[in-house]
Every structure is written in C-alpha cells, then in structure tokens.
C-alpha cells in the first residue's frame, strides 16, 4: 500500500498537527513536495527540510536534537518532487530507518529561512501486518499546494 501525503501549508491536518497515517510493514509513505505552476504565491514558495524526530521534537516542532534526523529537502517548488519511505523492519541502506510494529514515528518540516512555510507535522503509526497489495491513500490533495 502506498500512502501519499501532500506536504504543504494548505494541508490543514499537517498544519494542526493531527495528521496520523497508519502503515503496515512493506507499505510506502510518499511525501509530495509543494509544487507551483507559474510564478507561485505572492509571499513566495514553500521550501523546507523534513525530519524524523522524537516526541519532544514533534511537540515543540524542533529538529535540533540528536534524535532529529534530516530525511529530505523540498527545495524545488517549480519541479515535481516526491520522496518515498519504505516501512520495513530491516533496512539495507545506511541512511534508511528500521520501523517497528506497534511504534509511532514523527515527521516535521522546518521552513527554510527564506520560505513562507509553517511548521507541519505528521505521525506515522506502524501496524503489525506485512502487506502485499498496491493501493494509494492520500493525505491532502495536490490542489492544496
């Protein structure tokens, strides 16, 4: 299963901090960066770095501690950029994360200094079963960029 999250300030759940997606092992979390056609908004485009953080980092929307790992950067607002996280128990990659069933993981975005963005937050709850099927569950929509 692929869970698509449109990561931008127009996504009210990310903005409120009550967005929770439930994923199973072998699912994918697809993060879609903000994308603008034409000149973009008058206040400027949203650009930011996305971090996996611990609970205190999620609560305070801070990504500066030793448990705040930079995952991706959304810095090309006029291109189509998407990142994927595979929810797996063991990772073959040194920069990958190992996800444990029953645990919750926290993602936040920290706007770059020149960006118009705000703090956005997402909780990822990892469930127990391994899944094989391919389907998509979006959070937000592309029109919310």
């Amino acid at each position: 299963v692929r869970h698509v999250v449109y990561w931008n300030s127009s996504n009210p759940r990310l903005l409120r901090g009550d967005a929770v997606v439930e994923l199973g092992l072998n699912d994918y979390l697809d993060i879609v960066c903000p994308h603008y056609e034409g000149p973009g908004p008058p206040e400027g485009p949203e650009t930011f770095a996305l971090y996996m953080v611990d609970w205190p980092g999620y609560e305070s929307c801070q990504a500066e501690g030793p448990r705040a790992f930079k995952r991706w950067v959304c810095s090309l607002p006029f291109g189509h950029v998407q990142f994927s996280e595979k929810i797996q128990r063991f990772t073959p990659f040194s920069l990958g994360f190992e996800f444990l069933p029953g645990e919750t993981y926290y993602y936040i975005s920290v706007p770059t200094p020149e960006s118009s963005g705000q703090c956005l937050r997402l909780q990822v709850s990892v469930c127990c079963k391994e899944r094989k099927s391919e389907s998509a569950h979006p959070v937000g929509s592309p029109g919310e960029s």
């Epitope: 611990d54 609970w55 205190p56 305070s60 500066e64 501690g65 030793p66 790992f69 930079k70």
Partner: antibody
Framework: QVQLVQSGAEVKKPGASVKVSCKAS????????IHWVRQAPGQGLEWMGW????????KYNERFKGRVTMTTDTSTSTAYMELRSLRSDDTAVYYC?????????????WGQGTSVTVSS | DIVMTQTPLSLSVTPGQPASISCRSS???????????LYWYLQKPGQSPQLLIY???NRFSGVPDRFSGSGSGTDFTLKISRVEAEDVGVYYC?????????FGGGTKVEIK
Amino acid sequence: QVQLVQSGAEVKKPGASVKVSCKASGYTFTGYYIHWVRQAPGQGLEWMGWIYPGNFNTKYNERFKGRVTMTTDTSTSTAYMELRSLRSDDTAVYYCAREDGSPYYAMDYWGQGTSVTVSS
Amino acid sequence: DIVMTQTPLSLSVTPGQPASISCRSSQSLVHSNGNTFLYWYLQKPGQSPQLLIYRVSNRFSGVPDRFSGSGSGTDFTLKISRVEAEDVGVYYCFQATHVPWTFGGGTKVEIK
C-alpha cells in the same frame, strides 16, 4: 532543585538479575529522557541506553540488548534499569542521568551511583 | 561503534598553568541535522560526572570561563586556561551523534 536518588549497593551471584532504581524530583519527570551509564572499577564510562518517560520509548546500546530493560513508573517519578544474566564483568557503578532538552541535549544531572558487585 | 580517542591519558599541571585535552572520533560527529553532539564531562574523585561543555563549545551553567571547548568534524579540544586545584579529576569527551553514544577513555588531570 533537580535530584536523582538511586537505590543502594547490591551484591549478586553470576547468572542473577539486578534492578536499580532512580527516583527523580524537582522537575517534570515525563518531559526528560533518563539515561543509564555504567563505570567498571578503575575504568571509564559506558552508555547503556535511554528511556523517555513521556511515552516509554527506549534505545539500548546493542552491547546490552536482550539483557537490559529500562522502565519508568510515572506515578512515583522513578526510573528502573534491570540487567539480567549477570557476569563478573558487570561489576560496576551504575548511574542514572537526566538529559536536558534544547539547547543542551546533554546529561546535566546525575544520580549518586549504585554499586553492583557480581561475585560467586 | 564510534571510537573516541583521548590524549593524553594523564596530565600533571602546575596551578595557574594552562592544560589542553584532545579528543578524536573515528567518524565525523556532524549529525544529519547539522549539529555536532560532542560534550565534555569531568568526574571528580569519588563523585558522579558533571557536565562542562555541551555541543562542542558551549559552557554549561555554573562552569567557570577558564574552561573552553573547540573543534569540528572529528577533532575536538578542551582547554583550561589556568588550572586550579579543584579541577583535578578525569575528563571525558562524549558523543551523541551516532548510536550507541560513546565516551572517550578519559584523561586524568592532577596538580603538580
């Protein structure tokens, strides 16, 4: 003022388990990580792992995985570290320490230490 | 695991003289978030360790300004500008960038 008070010295036989307690006061217990660090006689410091009392998340040093369990009782603001299958080289002073948050992310307050002796 | 190598192992210093302790890590201590989680602790005889320096160069509250930390990447230094009798003990560097978090082997400072 912040204080971490640990349980008293223990003498254990090889193969046994020990559970050391660390009672916190003077701050909001659920808002700070608690670490466990040990020091063998005449040796340096070794980080064992941490627990976050706010959600009970733990991270253990792989060297102790399977033998160590860190828990907390939020009703009494007490952290516990249990070490199983004790060996003679587990003889050490065991410290609990609080990790302060931003901007430090450092172990700023330490317990007085608990001496654990493993001997047959 | 990250190996933290401290030099020298011991140091005998005349009061009022400077002292310098080096700490070298087996890998860069720059975290993916850009911060460097390198700390210095002092363990006085018969006491628990106490925090001196956090994140490379910041003095913890109550730490005298004769203590300073510097460095980047894999090489770090703790300097005491004028050693006093109360500074005796074992100094440890400590990294929290990579799990497992690891301490250096310690540097024993004594007064001549």
